[in-house]
């Protein structure tokens, strides 16, 4: 693994893709989504230590300034680098429609 | 302002653009950048309460699951929605070069 992918905090502690099983009720969708009834939500969770999966120059700057001024500048944050699309069967005024969302499930993660 | 831009925690507490004055030394750039000697670094700082500047559907899901399972799912995070380019005058083996970085300064912010 590249240096940027090796977690210094121990396995599974750094920014990574994580799956959470959620119902329509959990997601607050029960009133407008018919299907799926449950979703395997993939999201980005974990710490962003120095040089770990830094997304860009901005992330490097932020980490350097966080080390200097931790009370002012937060550490970089683990967020999606890209998404997987997902289709939802939605209730409409007249029935149902199928809508594909491109920004619903995280595909991979980085630190920004 | 849209509901998504009104901070329920009070002025300046929610996700917003923030400027930090930094020297080349602060940034760890002194050995490879000649100019500028100081940078007004714009970055995204602040809390992401429910419905505040949600970037996409993923952010909505994350907030709903955070409220349900705060120990497992973190709240959305304040990150750049876009960047302003910046030119750096860099030292090279033979002299200097001008390099434009597109991902260095945050332009505006949202919650993901």
């Amino acid at each position: 693994a590249r240096n940027g992918d090796r977690c210094p905090l121990g396995p599974g502690r750094c920014c990574r893709l994580h799956t959470v099983h959620a119902s329509l009720e959990d997601l607050g969708w029960a009133d407008w989504v018919l299907s799926p009834r449950e979703v395997q939500v993939t999201m980005c969770i974990g710490a962003c230590p120095s040089q770990f999966r830094e997304a860009n120059m901005h992330a490097q700057i932020k980490m350097n300034l966080h080390r200097l001024k931790p009370d002012t500048v937060p550490a970089p944050c683990c967020v999606p680098a890209s998404y997987n699309p997902m289709v939802l069967i939605q209730k409409t005024d007249t029935g149902v429609s199928l809508q594909t969302y491109d920004d619903l499930l995280a595909k991979d993660c980085h630190c920004v | 302002a849209r509901n998504g831009d009104r901070c329920p925690l009070g002025p300046g507490r929610c996700c917003r653009l923030h400027t930090v004055h930094a020297s080349l030394e602060d940034l760890g750039w002194a050995d490879w950048v000649l100019s500028p000697r100081e940078v007004q670094v714009t970055m995204c700082i602040g809390a992401c309460p429910s419905q505040f500047r949600e970037a996409n559907m993923h952010a909505q899901i994350k907030m709903n699951l955070h409220r349900l399972k705060p120990d497992t799912v973190p709240a959305p995070c304040c990150v750049p929605a876009s960047y302003n380019p910046m030119v750096l005058i860099q030292k090279t083996d033979t002299g200097v070069s001008l390099q434009t970085y597109d991902d260095l300064l945050a332009k505006d912010c949202h919650c993901v």
Epitope: S35, P36, N84, P85, M86, V87, L88, V96, L98, T100 | -
Partner: antibody, heavy 118, light 107 residues
Framework: QVTLKESGPGILQPSQTLSLTCSFS??????????VDWIRQSSGKGLEWLAH???????RYNPSLKSRLTISKDTSSNQVFLKITSVDTADTATYYC??????????WGQGTSFTVSS | DIVMTQAQKFMSTSVGDRVSVTCKAR??????VAWYQQKPGQSPKALIY???YRYSGVPDRFTGSGSGTDFTLTISNVQSEDLAEYFC?????????FGGGTKLEIK
């Protein structure tokens, strides 16, 4: 615009293997929730669901035919395939593929006619 | 397998009338029922999802109802283009099964 089109050999002899192709456009099998089903229709048995395949390669078969069916996909070329081994006259039918979104089959192809003849 | 029974193979109606096509499941399938329309020489077209929800583009004269074991597709103000065979289908459990179909004839 969602379209699906089935293709196959038209006619085979008993005991041969039927290979069907469903070529589709207007959606992607990389999208969570998307799948493709195969259904056949004959005058004797009406509409009969055969199999489906999901975006994540989850496959389901009709138990009455499971030992003879194989469904597969080529995501990059937007195609789904169905193989039926050891065909006999009872397999004479029109074969349809349909788009599946979770549990909804909302678009069907035009169908391809297949006959088993000795 | 869950048997879906459409007792009436044929129904005759006139333009402007209201007609109800029924479908009975041998066991409880909740609302996991779809309805399809198949015009002569064409492939099936999806009309109704989850027993009562019309797909977008389906005229509002088509209405689905029912839950458990008894389901109905009602066509109000029948039009000549509604001449077709109508099938119910359960997707509550594998294998998915279809009703035998009801052919609607226009007088």
């Amino acid at each position: 615009q969602v379209t699906l089109k089935e293709s196959g050999p038209g006619i085979l002899q008993p005991s041969q293997t039927l290979s069907l192709t469903c070529s589709f456009s207007g959606f992607s099998l990389t999208t969570s929730g998307m799948g493709v089903d195969w259904i056949r229709q004959s005058s004797g048995k009406g509409l009969e669901w055969l199999a489906h395949i999901y975006w994540d390669d989850d496959k389901r078969y009709n138990p009455s035919l499971k030992s003879r069916l194989t469904i597969s996909k080529d995501t990059s070329s937007n195609q789904v395939f169905l193989k039926i081994t050891s065909v006999d006259t009872a397999d004479t039918a029109t074969y349809y593929c349909a788009r599946r979104a979770w549990d909804a089959m909302d678009y069907w192809g035009q169908g391809t006619s297949f006959t088993v003849s000795s | 397998d869950i048997v879906m029974t459409q007792a009436q193979k044929f129904m005759s109606t006139s333009v402007g009338d209201r007609v109800s096509v029924t479908c009975k499941a041998r066991q409880n399938v909740g609302t996991n029922v779809a309805w399809y329309q198949q015009k002569p020489g064409q492939s099936p077209k999806a009309l109704i999802y989850s027993a009562s929800y019309r797909y977008s583009g389906v005229p509002d004269r088509f209405t689905g109802s029912g839950s458990g074991t008894d389901f109905t597709l009602t066509i109000s103000n029948v039009q000549s283009e509604d001449l077709a065979e109508y099938f119910c289908q359960q997707y509550n459990s594998y294998p998915y099964t279809f009703g035998g179909g009801t052919k609607l004839e226009i007088k």
